[in-house]
C-alpha cells in the first residue's frame, strides 16, 4: 500500500480542501473511525488500484486517524494497513469529543491506561489535573493519543489554552474493578425522572456485617450533602441497604451516582455506579422507522412493530381508519404493549389470518400528559393470483381465441405461451412465448379492472389466434408478488372433428 | 499559497476532443501530484483522474479516452480528453494532491450531441 502524501503525521488548515490518496495492486479503502468517508476509486493502466480521499471545508473535528486497507483485507501483515494522523488546527474546537464509554475506564488490574483527552492542534500544551485539583501531574502527553499512565480511581480533566481562553475537557472517570469479598450493587426505583419527581437509590452489600457507605453524586459536588439512610434487611442475613433519596430533583442532578462501601478489617472496598438522566418534561420518541406502506399477506398472520423510548410511561392506542382498535373476541387481532426496558416499548399489533376488509390506514398513537407521537401507514393485503377461466371460442371470423381471466394484488403480469409438439413439449421443448409481436399469427388483448371491494385487480386477456394448423397446448401463466398460477387448454384446428 | 488556473474548456461536438491546462503556482514543488475533478450541473464534484509518483489513475467512466500529464515545465499539468460525451459536460477544476489548498474558479466543458 502506497499512501500519498506518506505522513505519517499531516497538520492541515481549518476551512481548506486536502485530498490524499491510497494505492495498492487490489482495490483499496480509507477508513475513520471504523467507517468508510465518501471516497473514489481509480485504476492505473498497470492494473493498480486507487482510492481518493477528498477532504473538503476542513475543521478541526476532521482531525484523527485515517487507516488505508486492502478492500478485501484477509492477511494482518503490516503492509496491509496505512495509518496517517492528521491534525486541523480549529480554535473554535477545544477538546475533541468522546463518546460516552470513553470517558469511563475501567481497570481490573494495575496497569498502564490512556486518558483519551485530544486537541486539533500538536503546537498546544496540554495538562492532565484531578477533577478537583488546579496541580498539574506529571504524566507524558501523546497528541495523537492523550496522557498515558498508571491512575488511581478518580475523576480526571485535561486543560489547554488557546489563544487567550483556558478550555477544559469532560471529565474522565477511572474505575479500578477489584476482585473483591464485597459484593455491591446498586439500583435505582427510576433512573430517568422529571423535575419535581424524586430520585430514590439503593446501595446493598452482602456478607459483611460492618461497612462504610459513602455516596458520591452531583449534588454533593456542588456542597448540597444529602443524607443516606442505613438499613439491614432483616430477612437476608448480613444484607445492608444504604439508601439515597433526592426529593423534588432539578436538572442538575443529571449525572453518575457512586456508591462506594468499605470494610476495614481486610480493608477490601468495592464500588458500583450508576447513571441518573432528570428531563425537563417527559418525552416520547420513536425508534427506528416504519415504512408508509406495509404488506400483508392474505389468510396469513402479520405483526406491525412499533419501538419507541418514553417517559412516564404511555398510553397506547391502535387505530384504523380513524376508528380504535381493541383486542378482537374472535382472536383476529391482538395488540400488546410491552416495556423492554426502564423507558424502551414495544408496541406490537398482530392481523390474525389477514382478511381484505383489514386493508386501510393503521395509526399507531403513544401519548402522556407531557408528550404524544403518532406512526402512521397504508396496509396492503396482497392476494396470491388466480386463473379464474381459461376458454376457448371460434368466432365466425374464422380466428380462433382464447381467453384468460385471473385475480390478484398486487396487479398480475400475464404470460402467454403455447407449444406445438404436445408429446414432447413442455418437458424436453421449451413452450414458445405469444403476445403482440411482429407476427400476424397471435394478437392479445389485456384488460386490468381494480376491484375496490375486493381490494383486488382483475386480469382479462384475449388471445387470437390466426391460423391453427394443428393441436396447439396454449397456457395462461399469471404471476404477481405472492404467487403465478397457470391453466392450460388444447386449441385444435377448425377442420379437427375433436377436441381433446 | 497554493494559485491554480485551468484553461482549455468550451464547446465540443459529441466524439470530440479538449485538452485542459492547469497552471500552477505557490509552493507547488510539495505537492504529490494533481487530481483533475469535474462537477455537472446539479451534481456533486468528482474526481475524473489523477497522476501520483509518476502513475496515472482514472475513474471507470473516462478511462482510455481521458490522458493525465504534466508538462516539462513542471507547473502545468494537462487533461486530454477524447471521444467527448454529452455526460463529460461541466466545470473541470484541478487540484493539488497532498497540499491544503483552495478550489479555483475551474473551466467549462460543454459537450453537445
Known amino acids: 500500500l502506497v499512501v500519498t502524501p506518506p505522513g505519517p503525521e499531516l497538520v492541515l488548515n481549518v476551512s481548506s480542501t486536502f485530498v490524499l490518496t491510497c494505492s495498492g495492486s487490489a482495490p483499496v479503502v480509507w477508513e475513520r473511525m471504523s467507517q468508510e468517508p465518501p471516497q473514489e476509486m481509480a485504476k492505473a493502466q498497470d492494473g493498480t488500484f486507487s482510492s481518493v480521499l477528498t477532504l473538503t471545508n476542513l475543521t478541526g473535528l476532521d482531525t484523527g486517524e485515517y487507516f488505508c486497507t486492502h478492500n478485501d483485507s484477509r492477511g494482518l501483515e503490516t503492509d496491509e494497513r496505512k495509518r496517517l494522523y492528521i491534525f486541523v488546527p480549529d480554535p473554535t474546537v477545544g477538546f475533541l469529543p468522546n463518546d460516552a464509554e470513553e470517558l469511563f475506564i475501567f481497570l481490573t488490574e494495575i496497569t498502564e491506561i490512556t486518558i483519551p483527552c485530544r486537541v486539533t492542534d500538536p503546537q498546544l500544551v496540554v495538562t492532565l489535573h484531578e477533577k478537583k485539583g488546579d496541580v498539574a501531574l506529571p504524566v507524558p502527553y501523546d497528541h495523537q493519543r492523550g496522557f498515558s499512565g498508571i491512575f488511581e480511581d478518580r475523576s480526571y480533566i485535561c486543560k489547554t489554552t488557546i489563544g487567550d481562553r483556558e478550555v477544559d475537557s469532560d471529565a474522565y472517570y477511572v474505575y479500578r474493578l477489584q476482585v473483591s469479598s464485597i459484593n455491591v450493587s446498586v439500583n435505582a426505583v427510576q433512573t430517568v425522572v422529571r423535575q419535581g419527581e424524586n430520585i430514590t437509590l439503593m446501595c446493598i452489600v452482602i456478607g459483611n456485617e460492618v461497612v462504610n457507605f459513602e455516596w458520591t453524586y452531583p449534588r454533593k459536588e456542588s456542597g448540597r450533602l444529602v443524607e443516606p439512610v442505613t438499613d439491614f434487611l432483616l430477612d437476608m442475613p448480613y444484607h445492608i441497604r444504604s439508601i439515597l433519596h433526592i426529593p423534588s430533583a432539578e436538572l442538575e442532578d443529571s449525572g453518575t451516582y457512586t456508591c462506594n462501601v468499605t470494610e476495614s478489617v481486610n480493608d477490601h472496598q468495592d464500588e458500583k455506579a450508576i447513571n441518573i438522566t432528570v428531563v425537563e418534561s417527559g418525552y416520547v420518541r420513536l425508534l427506528g422507522e416504519v415504512g408508509t406502506l406495509q404488506f400483508a399477506e392474505l389468510h396469513r398472520s402479520r405483526t406491525l412493530q412499533v419501538v419507541f423510548e418514553a417517559y412516564p410511561p404511555p398510553t397506547v392506542l391502535w387505530f384504523k381508519d380513524n376508528r380504535t382498535l381493541g383486542d378482537s373476541s374472535a382472536g383476529e387481532i391482538a395488540l400488546s404493549t410491552r416495556n423492554v426496558s426502564e423507558t424502551r416499548y414495544v408496541s406490537e399489533l398482530t392481523l390474525v389470518r389477514v382478511k381484505v376488509a383489514e386493508a386501510g390506514h393503521y395509526t399507531m398513537r403513544a401519548f402522556h400528559e407531557d408528550a404524544e407521537v403518532q406512526l402512521s401507514f397504508q396496509l396492503q393485503i396482497n392476494v396470491p393470483v388466480r386463473v379464474l377461466e381459461l376458454s376457448e371460442s371460434h368466432p365466425d371470423s374464422g380466428e380462433q381465441t382464447v381467453r384468460c381471466r385471473g385475480r390478484g394484488m398486487p396487479q398480475p403480469n400475464i404470460i402467454w405461451s403455447a407449444c406445438r409438439d404436445l408429446k414432447r413439449c413442455p418437458r424436453e421443448l421449451p413452450p414458445t412465448l405469444l403476445g403482440n409481436s411482429s407476427e400476424e399469427e397471435s394478437q392479445l388483448e389485456t384488460n386490468v379492472t381494480y376491484w375496490e371491494e375486493e381490494q383486488e385487480f382483475e386480469v382479462v386477456s384475449t388471445l387470437r389466434l390466426q391460423h391453427v394448423d394443428r393441436p396447439l397446448s396454449v397456457r395462461c401463466t399469471l404471476r404477481n408478488a405472492v404467487g403465478q398460477d397457470t391453466q392450460e387448454v388444447i386449441v385444435v384446428p377448425h377442420s379437427l372433428p375433436f377436441k381433446v | 499559497e497554493v494559485q491554480l488556473v485551468e484553461s482549455g474548456g468550451g464547446l465540443a461536438q459529441a466524439g470530440g476532443s479538449l485538452r485542459l491546462s492547469c497552471v500552477a503556482s505557490?509552493?507547488?514543488?510539495?505537492?504529490?501530484?494533481m487530481a483533475w475533478y469535474r462537477q455537472a450541473p446539479g451534481k456533486q464534484r468528482e474526481l475524473v483522474a489523477h497522476?501520483?509518483?509518476?502513475?496515472?489513475y482514472y475513474v471507470a467512466s473516462v478511462e482510455g479516452r481521458f490522458t493525465i500529464s504534466r508538462a516539462n515545465a513542471k507547473d502545468t499539468w494537462y487533461l486530454q480528453m477524447n471521444s467527448l460525451k454529452p455526460e463529460d459536460t461541466g466545470v473541470y477544476y484541478c487540484?493539488?494532491?497532498?497540499?491544503?489548498?483552495?478550489w479555483s474558479q475551474g473551466t467549462q466543458v460543454t459537450v453537445s450531441s
Open positions: 487540484f493539488p494532491i497532498g497540499l491544503s489548498a483552495h
Open positions: 505557490g509552493n507547488i514543488d510539495s505537492a504529490n501530484g
Open positions: 497522476i501520483t509518483s509518476g502513475t496515472s
